[in-house]
Amino acid sequence: KFSKQSWGLENEALIVRCPRQGKPSYTVDWYYSQTNKSIPTQERNRVFASGQLLKFLPAAVADSGIYTCIVRSPTFNRTGYANVTIYKKQSDCNVPDYLMYSTVSGSEKNSKIYCPTIDLYNWTAPLEWFKNCQALQGSRYRAHKSFLVIDNVMTEDAGDYTCKFIHNENGANYSVTATRSFTVKDEQGFSLFPVIGAPAQNEIKEVEIGKNANLTCSACFGKGTQFLAAVLWQLNGTKITDFGEPRIQQEEGQNQSFSNGLACLDMVLRIADVKEEDLLLQYDCLALNLHGLRRHTVRLSRKNPIDHHSIYC
């Protein structure tokens, strides 16, 4: 958790986040671990620290090494380590395993491939996507925000997908590429312990007082017909129907999808006219089947009037 691997290609931008999380007001100092030498914060440097972020603009092979970040509150210092490796660009098309981000799997309907680490960068849409070094073309491929959507996925769609985007820093542009493998599931029906795709565990959802808000509980249970599978919301450990707040209702979203895909269920929690007291509640997304129950907790926080991007993933 507090030692994180990061990698990039020479002459591309690489931005690394301190694995230690702190409040925005806490100071973060970065050091070269081997020499204990402080990393400068001045943006004129090719490698510089910017709060929780360490920026290589652009990266060089010689930058490889372990970097220490120390997050300082008034009374506590907490340390994280970033293990950075910068590789030379490959002359051929093959992307070696050590440059690959985590493999994602898809099924026939609405497969999404997220562009890894993109949230750390100052980029503008659209992303460019490549499969095995070939630019993706055709109506089946849709670049949407930070992910690629492939319609009607086939087994032939498996392969290595690279996203390419431009990071802008003080008017200067730097290229970034990231690659991950995509596999297409084609197994017989099976049942798994529920996997909640959304919300993330302990997610903080920003809402505006007086406005409506929707929370989606989305979970997958395996493939094929599921004999017992359910998703539901609880408020402070109580079923929505028993909670007795008419402003807060749940309704089923997208039903199970069986055509070569995972069996998944959505349940949407609709909060009408969000009130202050709603921020005090604990919202639990529950997914259960014959294997057991999984719970992800969401909390609401008031949306700031000025919506600046969080420095956290």
């Epitope: 958790k1 507090f2 999380q21 702190g22 409040k23 509150s73 008034p74 009374t75 506590f76 907490r78 340390t79 302990n202 997610e203 903080i204 202050e276 921020l279 005090l280 604990q282 907790t297 909390r299 609401l300 926080s301 008031r302």
Partner: antibody
Framework: EVQLLESGGGLVQPGGSLRLSCAAS????????MIWVRQAPGKGLEWVST????????AYADSVKGRFTISRDNSKNTLYLQMNSLRAEDTAVYYC????????????????WGQGTLVTVSS | EIVLTQSPATLSLSPGERATLSCRAS??????LAWYQQKPGQAPRLLIY???NRATGIPARFSGSGSGTDFTLTISSLEPEDFAVYYC?????????FGQGTKVEIK
Amino acid sequence: EVQLLESGGGLVQPGGSLRLSCAASGFTFSSYDMIWVRQAPGKGLEWVSTIRGEGGTTAYADSVKGRFTISRDNSKNTLYLQMNSLRAEDTAVYYCARDPWSTEGSFFVLDYWGQGTLVTVSS
Amino acid sequence: EIVLTQSPATLSLSPGERATLSCRASQSVDDDLAWYQQKPGQAPRLLIYDASNRATGIPARFSGSGSGTDFTLTISSLEPEDFAVYYCQQYITAPLTFGQGTKVEIK
């Protein structure tokens, strides 16, 4: 100097209610998550509840969920624990404590504690 | 929830001796583990955070080590004021949980 002072404990019958208070001083109260921890006589420590600095997010131990409510008044630098439907097993010394790191979605240690207030649930 | 198991339950030692207290987690807590000292009639006092960092004002004879599931609190040379109950606590996820405590008593 950071100080936390609990009050409101006492003897209450099963099924009854009690409201504990914790007066804080010596630090910017609204910037810190606050926690209630309890300790049954001769037993170990048990986390009860946490409230984020802005007061909008709370978390509870399963043993008290639905019966206890944590709240805070940042203008008064005071933390509260409203305890309803009290049971004999809620008998304990209740401590309020401060989480000095408190980033959203994460927890940390408790660096300052009050001296505690005893709650006895008995008929 | 993550269960923390402390051992031994009681440690009988003399002043000047070395004390070694163990805390084992039911699943990995990385280094999100703290140690507290509690004396009779008093609130707990933070000794160690992030498994190995001494809190402000804690004497150097207290040290923590470990990561993942196995942790150790070591008191290199017991002073008379060190005889107390020691608790470990994990804070990687809610609910926050404590070990059942180890009592360090005078032999």
